[in-house]
Interface confidence: medium
């Protein structure tokens, strides 16, 4: 079946200085700014644009080694980066993949608000666990707050 | 059964003040941004105010800074404070969840309290 | 802000007909497009989320398309408890703003 998740979650920092951070330069900012929850992420095919596989890596100790994701869509113009988990992870025998969108839309404040809708094919009649959603979304939150967090203390950075 | 139910309102006058509560059951009120809405006499829908799971909370300018969304999480309970009232903020004024399956539609409202502000 | 406009303001139709509301968004988004039914006295009620996707317990008569600044909410077979006021509604950005409604009458 395909079980939706949506979350929305508001940021101080302005849309596209956001998308710029967080998602065109995720793949470098994440581990530098998050180590305890990603330490690397490679390109294994494409050069970034949809199509794209990357590997993440997690450090030792977390309930994952890795996750392979594709690269489904990127528009700059809207703030918008699709991609699917396809391998590791939570994927396996219960789960076939998971379809990410995030949105990062202005917010009337000057900051903007990440709209990140979740789509989980699973395998057979098999139904997804509402605790692992939570936890993933926790995981995506404090990914954003750490991004938020560098880009305060470093004014410069990706304007 | 998941329900919302909204109380508060009344008669009051202008430059009164008021606090409507919606007492949610069957979901937690801080797993889900939550927002008032309110339908003035013979009007259409008007969004108010939101109140994101986070806490983050955001205001249509019609209201910002005479209303405050809160939410009390062991009472399970979300509030609006409404000061400097006016006339013009006579309504129904509902409480509705946003959806986390949905894509941030509205799929619980609660029944609606009235609220009246005249001299 | 995100302005919608509905259309027609008011209709009159007969059991059976199909009916079609159109609401069209002043900027152009994806995804975050309700609509609501209303009957007088009482809250609004979802019939259609994310643009097409049918809320759980809503007759199958009821579906909804569109994207960009353009979407419809369609009935297939009007059925005499289908009057009301029905309202589009965006999700996608604050402040939500929802169409001024349809009031559909049965003939």
């Known amino acids: 079946g395909v079980f939706n998740y949506e979350a929305e979650t508001p940021s101080v920092i302005p849309a596209a200085r956001l998308f710029k951070a967080f998602i065109l330069d995720g793949d470098k900012l994440l581990p530098k700014v998050a180590p305890e929850a990603v330490s690397s992420v490679e390109n294994i095919e494409g050069n970034g644009g949809p199509g794209t596989i990357k590997k993440i890596t997690f450090p030792e100790g977390s309930p994952f080694k890795y996750v392979k994701e594709r690269v489904d869509e990127v528009d700059r113009v809207n703030f918008k980066y699709s991609f699917s988990v396809i391998e590791g992870g939570a994927v396996g025998d219960a789960l076939e993949k998971v379809c990410n969108e995030i949105k990062i839309v202005a917010a009337p404040d000057g900051g903007s608000i990440l709209k990140i809708s979740n789509k989980f094919h699973t395998k057979g009649d098999h139904e997804i666990n509402a605790e692992q959603i939570k936890i993933e979304k926790e995981k995506a939150v404090g990914l954003l707050k750490a991004v938020e967090s560098y880009l305060l203390a470093h004014s410069d950075a990706y304007n | 059964e998941v329900q919302l139910v909204e109380s508060g309102g009344g008669l009051v006058q202008p430059g009164g003040s008021l606090r409507l509560s919606c007492a949610a059951s069957g979901f937690t009120v801080s797993s889900n941004s939550m927002s008032w809405v309110r339908q003035a006499p013979g009007e259409g829908l008007e969004w108010v105010s939101v109140i994101f799971s986070g806490g983050i909370t955001y205001y249509s300018d019609s209201v910002k800074g005479r209303f405050t969304i809160s939410r009390h999480n062991s009472k399970n309970t979300l509030y609006l404070q409404m000061n400097s009232l006016r006339t013009e903020d006579t309504a129904v004024y509902y409480c509705?969840?946003?959806?986390?399956?949905?894509?941030?539609?509205?799929?619980?409202w609660g029944q609606g309290t009235m609220v009246t502000v005249s001299s | 802000d995100i302005q919608m406009t509905q259309s027609p303001s008011s209709l009159s139709a007969s059991v059976g007909d199909r009916v079609t509301i159109t609401c069209r968004a002043s900027q152009s988004f994806d995804t975050y497009l309700n609509w609501y039914q209303q009957k007088p006295g009482k809250a609004p009620n979802l019939l259609i989320y994310?643009?097409?996707s049918l809320q759980s317990g809503v007759p199958s008569r009821f579906s909804g398309s569109g994207s960009g600044t353009d979407f419809t909410l369609t009935i297939s077979s009007l059925q005499p408890e289908d009057f009301g006021t029905y309202y589009c509604q965006q999700s996608y950005s604050i402040p939500y703003t929802f169409g001024q409604g349809t009031k559909l009458e049965i003939k």
């Open positions: 509705a969840r946003h959806s986390n399956w949905n894509f941030d539609a509205f799929d619980i």
């Open positions: 994310a643009t097409s």
